[in-house]
Interface confidence: medium
């Protein structure tokens, strides 16, 4: 469970490995912030809707976020 | 590979303190979440906290609220705990384990160091 | 406070197939994922079966793991059983998030 409750950073652990496209309900990018100093990444999954924390800074993550991205604009009118 | 080594263990008397490391090797320590959990002799597994990869989100269990503390050197590949006001309850082994980075579940532990409260 | 009982021990002989139950109370057990870890005398606990049901890699896949919301638990399933699967076997998931909560255990013998 990679969350807190707190109003603080929300990520217990963060994860260099993308996450399936496929498995994924929603992705979401959580800019930095006076409550946290640092952008976090937050898969959620659907399965469970478990959400998983993805390394800003891994080169893996910013190639998925480039997918979802390319993906979103493609559906967009 | 992944290591975590437990030190600090000892013989404490009740109300004293006590404080438990953790060094751990072979993995990326500032991207992971650490738990401590204990076992007290004859007994069964007890989560005691958890730190988040940074520091800024530490959890404990109510057993151990307010009296312990989890930290974390991410300079040092170090996890802490400091153990104050110690009970003869809190007599246990003490795990230090590491939380998956892509997932929900413990991955790797270290081999515990005992820590016996009595007078 | 959400809570995992376990059966205190079970037994059985070499070959044979063994389940272990893991009831929960207090809440739903398939809110939030279930993780097996099995220790063995002397040693630190390792990780058989995590998110319900999969197995980590070197896991055999006589171990199996399975979810039944109507009983509201959690099950081990050790199929061809072996004496070096005698061992402590816990259930753990979550009381709320970050709360984790662990099974008081249960002790396999194989006779």
């Known amino acids: 469970v990679p969350l807190s409750r707190t109003v603080r950073c929300t990520c217990i652990s963060i994860s260099n490995q993308p996450v399936n496209p496929r498995s994924l309900e929603k992705l979401e990018i959580i800019p930095a912030s006076q409550f946290c100093p640092r952008v976090e990444i937050i898969a959620t999954m659907k399965k469970k809707g478990e959400k998983r924390c993805l390394n800003p800074e891994s080169k893996a993550i910013k190639n998925l976020l480039k997918a979802v991205s390319k993906e979103r604009s493609k559906r967009s009118p | 590979q992944v290591q975590l080594v437990e030190s600090g263990g000892g013989v404490v008397q009740p109300g004293r303190s006590l404080r438990l490391s953790c060094a751990a090797s072979g993995f990326t320590f500032s991207n992971s979440g650490i738990h401590w959990v204990r076992q007290a002799p004859g007994k069964g597994l007890e989560w005691v906290a958890v730190?988040?990869?940074?520091?800024?989100?530490?959890f404990y269990a109510d057993s151990v609220k307010g009296r312990f503390t989890i930290s974390r050197d991410n300079s040092k590949n170090t996890l802490y705990l400091q153990m104050n006001s110690l009970r003869a309850e809190d007599t246990a082994v003490y795990y230090c384990?590491?939380?998956?980075?892509?997932?929900?579940?413990?991955?790797?532990w270290g081999q515990g160091t005992l820590v016996t409260v009595s007078s | 406070n959400f809570m995992l009982t376990q059966p205190h021990s079970v037994s059985e002989s070499p070959g044979k197939t063994v389940t272990i139950s893991c009831t929960g109370s207090g809440g739903s057990i398939d809110r939030n994922y279930v993780q097996w870890y099995q220790q063995r005398p002397g040693s630190a606990p390792i990780t058989v079966i995590y998110e319900d049901n999969q197995r980590p890699s070197g896991v055999p896949d006589r171990f199996s793991g399975s979810i039944d919301s109507s009983s509201n638990s959690a099950s081990l399933t050790i199929s061809g059983l072996r004496t070096d699967d005698e061992a402590d076997y816990y259930c753990q998931s979550y009381d709320s998030i970050n709360l984790w909560v662990f099974g008081g255990g249960t002790k396999v013998t194989v006779l």
């Open positions: 384990a590491k939380l998956r980075d892509n997932g929900e579940y413990l991955d790797y």
């Open positions: 730190i988040s990869y940074d520091g800024s989100n530490k």
